[in-house]
């Protein structure tokens, strides 16, 4: 059981107050984290509270401002990037968001040696992506879908690609589906370790069907937004990978990296690129039917002036029980010999673990094992491997950092974080300096988050970087809800849940229950993290019990649970939420006449199906930006879990798993359907089709749209959304306003 330390004593009760909705909407109780911007083994940059860019040297204890807030303000910079030779800084301003990761901006180059902005050969605007080379001060940038190279910031640019075209050909940046569902970045170019080569992806979207929606704006006529967006079964982008020698870019030009024959024989994806050395690169490819992944190690052949990917350096990863990997196929972390690597994939028992691959995947040496999962490899040095896992005390929703000594035999394992601040910190991530000389630990909870700096050899804590003292003080007079994380054992399935309980929770009383669900494949909702959010308010002020349940399809508990939903989305995720609700009712403190469910995105899909399950368990529910049919969602994501919507593949389940097919079952529940009209991700089409089906079935429901809002419903829409949902739930639960 994880209980938030209670600060409620009878004598203090009258000075304590419950959370308000306003607290949540104002972000009153938000926390800070500290991630050093490492620039060497012992130095990092950090933007101070007054917006100076300060360089810290851990070993000398000295710090100095490298860029003043005055310089930042002179171009309204919101971000910066120091060149590795420390001669220049780029300043980023005019940030303009595009999709989840992508944005455009204006860039200015500031010369630290003379304290002036670089004049002459200024960068065009707006730029889609810009980055320094890893050594020196070469610049690569993407402008109007083409890649440019500068040897020095003041030099004229060398144009690498010429075929870039809006919505057609993307060079060095991903198209919509690669950005959202495969790379999870705004960029698709990668410098080699010493900046000799620049690799980039070219995405050809010429034949992809386009999603079009209205953007109403303020003009007389709405604009139409057009995005090449492959839905399930549609034509996909065609990807090619090129590498150019940045020292002699005009010599042979960009050289295409060959696709492994077994991948190229049918539709495929490029999934990631990892540089090993300046003359060795590792590419990962994935068949469109995403159960086969190939990792290909390619060498630069000076005699060919191109890249050689011998079959002997192809490593195949295949899943026979589901899709390849977790959410994504894991990426390799290469060791110092520049050919062997460490990688997370399923072991013979179906748990994701670290393996060491020297020659073939078949001969891989398993490094971690157990009925838990290795989650991320942070760093491999000559003698240590740092990784995170959820092994400690068998709580899948925790993250601790471990060190394995790989320099000694047999390797020894040490948990770096397990006993540091055991009650406060059970969910960590880490950020390492060069050669792991030092590292920062960022603890996300369950207590108030704290960031600390550590010695990479001894693991000794050097200093606290951020401990959120102001937040701690602000919370002293707040009645926070209690939280507990426990598990249910049902039919050989373990269902972990988090329950958020009102501050004066009394087991002998009855409380309304709200299920918050996401439930998407390879997700995890039950995590030992700190949060003061809308559901905290609902428990604290409105006296609701809120529960989050990780059912089948969720991550980090083995392949049996994860791959249970393969090819049948919308079945077990819903079943497991319903099963959990029944178990909660049995606990005796739930008012079974006042149970609701809500979710966003995939959670909106699950909540809709749960409401339409015909169980009579739910009085009401909310779906925000739900998927309503898998035929409407992106190919890369959907087909990973569902296969293709064709007769000879899985069309039948595509049709059976829609929300619309269950329209009749909404008759006995109160349903609130919410969607942004400019949702580029889960298109408004999804909710439009639910609404149409409900109208056609003559079923009453409530709905709210947010004009020109995307999948995140940000800004003022957020306030309106949570206010609206609060009213809906309070009405459903007969709670007075």
């Amino acid at each position: 059981i994880v209980l938030r330390p209670s600060r409620v004593h009878n004598s203090e009760e009258n000075t304590m107050r419950a959370l308000t909705l306003k607290d949540i909407l104002n972000g009153t109780f938000s926390y800070k984290t500290f991630f050093p911007n490492w620039i060497s083994g012992q130095e990092y940059l950090h933007q101070s509270a007054d917006n100076n860019i300060v360089l810290y040297n851990i070993e000398t204890g000295q710090s100095y401002t490298i860029l003043s807030n005055r310089t930042m303000k002179s171009v309204n910079a919101s971000n910066y990037g120091l060149s590795p030779d420390r001669q220049f800084v780029y300043l980023e301003s005019d940030y303009s968001k595009l999709w989840r990761y992508s944005y455009t901006a204006t860039y200015y180059i500031y010369d630290l040696s003379n304290g002036e902005f670089v004049r002459g050969n200024e960068l065009p605007r707006p730029i889609q992506y810009l980055c320094w080379s890893p050594v020196g001060s070469k610049l690569a940038y993407v402008y109007q879908n083409n890649i440019y190279l500068k040897q020095r910031p003041g030099d004229p640019p060398f144009q690498i690609t010429f075929n870039g075209r809006e919505n057609k050909i993307f060079n060095g940046i991903p198209d919509w589906v690669y950005e959202e569902e495969m790379l999870a970045t705004k960029y698709a170019l990668w410098w080699s370790p010493n900046g000799k080569f620049l690799a980039y992806a070219e995405f050809n979207d010429t034949d992809i069907p386009v999603i079009a929606y209205s953007y109403y704006g303020d003009e007389q006529y709405p604009r139409t937004i057009n995005i090449p967006y492959p839905k399930a079964g549609a034509k996909n982008p065609v990807v090619r990978i090129f590498i150019i020698d940045t020292t002699y870019p005009a010599y042979v030009g960009p050289q295409e990296v060959p696709v492994p024959a077994m991948i190229a024989s049918s539709d495929y994806y490029f999934s990631w690129l990892t540089w090993v050395t300046d003359e060795r690169v590792c590419l990962q490819w994935l068949k469109r039917v995403q159960n086969v992944s190939v990792l290909s190690i390619c060498d630069f052949r000076e005699d060919w002036q191109t890249w050689d990917c011998p079959k002997t350096q192809e490593h195949i990863e295949e899943s026979r029980t589901g899709w390849a990997g977790g959410f994504f196929v894991s990426t390799p972390v290469f060791s110092y010999d520049a050919i062997s690597y460490y990688k997370i994939f399923s072991d013979k028992d179906g748990y994701k673990h670290i393996h060491y691959i020297k020659d073939t995947v078949e001969n891989a040496i398993q490094i971690t094992s157990g009925k838990w999962e290795a989650i991320n490899i942070f760093r491999v040095t000559q003698d240590s491997l740092f990784y995170s896992s959820n092994e400690f005390e068998e709580y899948p929703g925790r993250r601790n950092i471990y060190r394995i000594s790989i320099g000694s035999y047999p390797p020894s394992k040490k948990c770096v974080t397990c006993h540091l601040r055991k009650e406060r910190c059970q969910y960590y991530t880490a950020s390492f300096s060069d050669y792991a000389k030092y590292y920062a630990l960022v603890c996300y909870g369950p207590g108030i988050p704290i960031s600390t700096l550590h010695d990479g050899r001894t693991d000794q804590e050097i200093k606290i970087l951020e401990e959120n003292k102001e937040l701690e003080n602000a919370l002293k007079n707040i009645q926070l809800p209690k939280e507990e994380i426990k598990k249910l054992e049902v039919d050989e399935i373990t269902l972990w849940y988090k329950m958020i309980l009102p501050p004066q929770f009394d087991r002998s009383k009855k409380y309304p229950l709200l299920i918050q669900v996401y439930g998407g494949p390879c997700s995890q909702s039950v995590r030992s993290v700190f949060a003061v959010n809308w559901i905290s308010y609902l428990a604290s002020k409105e006296g609701m019990v809120i529960a989050l349940v990780d059912g089948r399809g969720t991550a980090f508990q083995g392949d049996k649970l994860l791959y249970a939903v393969y090819r049948k989305l919308g079945v077990y995720e819903v079943e497991d939420q319903i099963t959990a609700v029944r178990k909660f009712i049995e606990m005796g403190f739930i008012d079974e006449k006042r149970i609701a469910i809500w979710g966003w995105s995939y959670g909106g899909y699950v909540s809709s199906l749960a409401l339409a399950s015909g169980t009579g368990l739910f009085k009401c529910g909310i779906a925000v930006a739900p998927v309503s049919s898998w035929e409407y969602y992106a190919s890369v994501y959907t087909e990973r879990f569902m296969g293709l919507p064709t007769k000879d593949d899985n069309l039948e389940h595509y049709k059976n798993s829609t929300v619309m097919a269950r329209a009749e079952y909404f008759r006995n529940v109160d349903y609130l359907l919410i969607h942004g009209t400019a949702d580029d991700n889960v298109h408004f089409q999804n909710s439009a089709q639910i609404a149409k089906a409900l109208v056609n079935a003559q079923v009453d429901f409530q709905a709210m749209w947010y004009s020109d809002q995307n999948h995140g419903l940000s800004g003022l829409s957020t306030n309106h959304l949570y206010t609206h949902m609060t009213h809906f739930l309070k009405q459903c639960f007969s709670l007075s306003d």
Partner: antibody
Amino acid sequence: QVQLVQSGAEVKKPGASVKVSCKASGYTFTENIIHWVRQAPGQGLEWMGWIHPASGSIKYAQKLQGRVTMTTDTSTSTAYMELRSLRSDDTAVYYCARHGGTGRGAMDYWGQGTLVTVSS
Amino acid sequence: EIVLTQSPGTLSLSPGERATLSCRASQSVSTSAYSYMHWYQQKPGQAPRLLIYLASNLESGIPDRFSGSGSGTDFTLTISRLEPEDFAVYYCQQSRELPYTFGQGTKLEIK
């Protein structure tokens, strides 16, 4: 037109060293790899290694590693191959050859050859 | 290393005849893009001369009676109608892997 002109014949004693030169003309010297290939009397061709004048990259055949050194002088567009600790079985005609731009490993122009005789 | 075996060792033919020379590699010298096999001609007292590069591409200035074919491990040099000046030693060479290797040569002699 492309030409590779090699230095003259050499007679060396076992244990000595020899340095053969190869002067290039008719093209941009730095752009192409220079290979060295040898041919013992009445025998086939044996690849010794290459040097890339632009990058300074050098690859040697395993069996000659430690005894051979390839260098270039870009100011004179000349490549050099030095072989040390000569043995009688090093007696051969030594060729320099230009790496063909599109050939990806084919040698499109050859020097006339330098006969090195190792004899006591 | 990749071993190249040429056959026959000696080929005796008359001018005007068709010559077929073979080269077999101990492992594939092809990728999805190219076959890294090249052919040279060497006459006594002369340096080798490039005839065919990347298995089938005719080097400029070489008569079109010379042609190359093959992929993977088996390659062929064909001279469609032998001319008197074609009688020489022919070598195949691979650049698929380092070290580069040559075949032992096929001697084409006048019958």
